[in-house]
Interface confidence: medium
């Protein structure tokens, strides 16, 4: 009974969600933001097993978002009652226990208003610091519902890069794109996490003929095209983007010319992938797979799928090419030779060959990375609540849906597929080697384009010496300590996740006159080629819903430390049949935080209202002010007690 | 061959810590999300971690998050899992496990080690 | 977390008999639900993933079916070598969760 009326409010929360929502700052002493306060305190309040019931001191920070339904997100302070939580008693009706012995907190939540008296909690963060004892952090997010989230949030990172780097691969505008700015991000707990993000991006100095990926010498151009993109990911159980897409609309430079276009004696060029200067090269490539793979099985090289070259000092190849299992065993045989004949079953990997060339010392220095193609994992949606996803499975691609001004949309191109062949031992996943593209930011010195899918490894985003370059103007993000995202840990990210935040001149320059798309889902899984549309004024669309297993009430902590793209790879369903198209472009709200826009001055205690300024000022009186040390700006994610 | 050795298990005392490690031999590591389970004696298994491919991301179990770390190097083909602020209810035999087979996602364990054993006693 | 269920706890059977386990989960996990058989002293093994599906080198006399919450897992023709202990797991949803065990022994 708890599980569908939780259902049901969720799903309300959703359909109600559908309409343009505008956000602004509020006044600390709101009597609604109170209500807010007070029922989120009394839900952190309801989920604390043991010891006192935790009072407010005083609210820091709010915003109030208004749409079909009204969110307050809020931060506030708390201090540890004399009150035991079994007491029958409620905050307000506690004092704060003797400061020295007193355990405080802050929390960061969202709450909906869905009257004048109904308040709900979609999400909760607090954390906690006992009177003596580490920082202690517990999670509630409403399972099923969508809430917005900061902004600045360190787990939209490993979306925005891939967002970007998908851009970049999938359209055919001329330049890079990079990052400019987050607009809003909401996400949704499901079995896994549901992500939906809009950003605006800016044209870099960077072409595509001459740059593979964004570098840190890509530099936006204040006259150049701008964009708007949403994108939307599921992060499935296994912590990888199980599916992925993006809807962007696109604005002309003002009066912007692109610059001439200088031979470039450095600058990667293709090559056929017959080419004769490619065979000494991937036979070294492949023996280098062979030596540094654990395999029982030589692998050799199946096709050759692209081939680049570079002049350095020497030469640099770039060759994409398909491994297959062979029946020669390491065991029984010194070297692979011709005779390797492929297993019909065997394992296929996707590989990326950087290869240097240094023709005077007769050296050669191959780097490999492959991933496993094919065998994938089927993924069903169970029966039960899932609002963002239709109900059937369909055909998986990645989709880039660019949208121009004052152009009409092509139709949806249908990328070239390879038949899908059997893998493995099991009658049920049934498909294998299709071609696909693969998504990195910043790769440094690699240039890998063909994403496979299943457990593919060592395909980061930023790997190498250039780690995620290009997402913001001159910001890095590093997710360098784990995000835990519940009970016992501090959480670290501060302000190291900037997304190129407030270039105001690359705002779209007030251009939003192209019409802006309906979402349109599609996957991370069998990634589409190359696309054959002429150029980023038409829409380039491949359609399918995605599976979400069932909601559950999950008790873990999920850690974002270092997202590589490695773990961006899901475990995908087969296309089995074709399904309805359906469009979703409400789904998810549009709602804006601005986690920057927070003033912090004193304000007279609560209820006086006439000085819209945070933070309050305490709600009650205490001997010994001993207001929660600021700690860094953290955020998580938990899946705990959604259900409760 | 495929195969997983877990070593590191011993005698501690509570508030101890402890760290274990996988040796994963005879399929490329670095492929594949790694797990530990833990079989507490005359009990159950238990589920206690992930770790993705690249060491990137990580997964706890309610009963170990804030104690317990996992973490891998690929270029050792090696699991790890630092445990912290142990407690009585921690001993167990702790495996490391993976769903080897591709298909199965990683969510269904189709290569065990054979365990190292963790005593928290005073 | 998703609790799983088996029943009965203890089996007794006579080998060449037909074994019938069961596994219930606190909520659907669509067919996403594994079975193990542990020895003692051994670590467990897969026997079936995906409710119904038979890892690589599993008798035929092991069989999975059932999906949602209500799951069994059928010996067919206990062999001596399958006394043991059998577990239902759920990959649903983190936490990954087992059941408690089912111990079929000899009669």
């Known amino acids: 009974m708890k599980l569908i009326t939780i259902l049901f409010l969720c799903s309300r929360l959703l359909l109600s969600l559908t309409q343009e929502s505008q956000s602004e700052e509020i006044d600390c002493n709101d009597k609604d933001l109170f209500k807010a306060v007070d029922a989120a305190l009394k839900k952190y309040n309801s989920q604390n097993q043991s010891n006192n019931q935790f009072v407010l001191y005083r609210i820091t920070e709010a915003t109030k978002t208004v749409g079909s339904d009204t969110f307050y997100s809020f931060k506030y302070e708390i201090k540890e009652g004399d009150c035991p939580v079994q007491s029958g008693k409620t905050w307000q009706d506690c004092e704060y226990k003797d400061a020295a012995k007193a355990a405080t907190g802050e929390c960061t939540a969202t709450v909906g208003k869905r009257s004048s008296t109904k308040f709900s909690v979609a999400t909760q963060t607090c954390q906690i610091t006992p009177a003596e004892g580490p920082v202690v952090t517990a999670q509630y997010d409403c399972l099923g519902c969508v809430h917005p989230i900061s902004t600045q949030s360190p787990d939209l990172e490993p979306i925005l890069r891939h967002g970007i780097q998908y851009f970049n691969n999938n359209t055919q505008h001329s330049s890079l794109f990079m990052l400019n700015e987050v607009k809003r991000a909401q996400r949704q707990v499901v079995a896994g996490l549901n992500f939906r993000i809009t950003y605006s991006i800016v044209q870099t100095n960077c072409s595509k003929e001459n740059f593979l990926f964004l570098t840190p010498d890509c530099k936006s151009l204040w006259n150049g095209d701008t964009g708007e993109c949403t994108d939307n990911a599921y992060i499935d159980i296994q912590l990888r983007i199980a599916s992925f897409s993006q809807n962007c609309d696109i604005y002309p430079g003002k009066d912007f010319v692109q610059p001439p276009t200088k031979i470039c004696v450095g600058c990667p060029r293709d090559i056929p992938t017959n080419s004769p200067e490619l065979e000494e090269t991937l036979t070294h490539t492949i023996t280098k797979l062979n030596a540094e793979n654990n395999a029982t099985f030589y692998f050799k090289i199946d096709n050759v799928k692209k081939a680049r070259v570079q002049v350095v000092a020497g030469k640099k190849y770039f060759i994409d090419f398909v491994a297959r299992e062979t029946t020669c065993s390491k065991e029984s045989n010194e070297e692979l030779t011709e005779s390797c004949e492929t297993k019909k079953l065997g394992q296929s990997l996707d590989c990326n060959a950087e290869v240097y060339v240094v023709p005077w010392e007769k050296k050669i220095y191959p780097t490999v990375n492959c991933q496993p193609l094919g065998m994938i994992s089927l993924m069903k949606r169970p029966p039960g609540f899932s609002p963002f996803r239709s109900s059937r499975i369909g055909e998986i691609k990645e989709e880039t849906t660019v949208s121009p001004p004052h152009t009409s949309m092509a139709p949806a191109q249908d990328e070239e597929r390879d038949s899908g062949k059997e893998q493995g031992h099991t009658r049920r996943h049934d498909w294998g080697h299709e071609k696909q593209r693969k998504h990195n930011l910043g790769h440094g010195h690699k240039h890998e384009r063909d994403q496979g899918h299943g457990h593919q490894r060592g395909h980061g985003l930023g790997h190498g010496h250039e780690q995620q370059h290009g997402l913001g103007h001159g910001h890095k993000f590093k997710l360098d300590d784990d995000l835990e995202h519940q009970g016992g840990h501090v959480l670290d990210h501060g302000h190291k996740h900037k997304h190129g935040h407030g270039h105001g001149k690359h705002k779209n320059k007030g251009k939003k006159n192209g019409k802006h798309n309906g979402w349109k889902t599609e996957h991370l899984a069998s990634s589409s080629e190359d696309s054959t549309t002429p150029s980023a004024q038409t829409q380039e669309k491949t359609e399918g819903p995605t599976p979400i297993p069932s909601l559950a009430k999950p008790g873990v902590t999920v850690t974002f430390s270092d997202f590589q793209d490695s773990d961006l790879i899901a475990t995908m369903m087969p296309p089995i049949s074709p399904a309805p198209i359906q469009s979703d472009d409400d789904w998810i709200p549009d709602i804006q935080i601005d986690p920057n826009g927070l003033s912090f001055n004193p304000i007279s205690d609560f209820p006086d209202t006439t000085s819209p300024k945070c933070p309050g000022r305490p709600w009650k009186s205490v001997s010994e002010i001993n207001p929660t040390t600021q700690m860094k700006e953290s955020y998580y994610f938990d899946l705990t007690d959604g259900l409760s | 061959e495929v195969q997983l050795l877990e070593s590191g298990g011993g005698l501690v005392q509570p508030g101890g810590s402890l760290r274990l490690s996988c040796a994963a031999s005879g399929f490329t590591f670095s492929y594949y999300g790694m797990n530990w389970v833990r079989q507490a004696p005359g009990k159950g298994l238990e589920w206690v971690s992930v770790i993705s491919p690249s060491g990137g991301l990580t997964v706890y179990a309610d009963s170990v998050k804030g104690r317990f770390t996992i973490s891998r190097d690929n270029s050792k083909n090696t699991l790890y899992l630092q445990m912290n602020s142990l407690r009585a209810e921690d001993t167990a035999m702790y495996y490391c496990?993976?769903?080897?087979?591709?298909?199965?996602?990683?969510?269904?364990?189709?290569?065990w080690g054979q365990g190292t054993m963790v005593t928290v006693s005073s | 977390d998703i609790q799983m269920t088996q029943s009965p706890a203890t089996l007794s059977m006579s080998p060449g008999e037909r074994a019938t386990l069961s596994c219930r989960a606190s909520q659907s996990v669509t067919t996403y639900l594994a079975w193990y058989q542990q020895k003692p002293g051994q670590a467990p093994r897969l026997l079936i993933y995906d409710a119904s599906i038979r890892a690589t080198g599993v008798p035929a006399r092991f069989s999975g079916s059932g999906s949602g919450t209500d799951f069994t897992l059928t010996i067919s023709r206990l062999e001596p070598e399958d006394f043991a202990v059998y577990y239902c797991?759920?990959?649903?949803?983190?936490?990954?969760?087992f059941g408690g065990g089912t111990k079929v022994e000899i009669k």
């Open positions: 496990a993976t769903g080897f087979a591709v298909q199965h996602g990683g969510g269904a364990f189709d290569i």
């Open positions: 797991q759920q990959r649903t949803i983190w936490p990954l969760t």
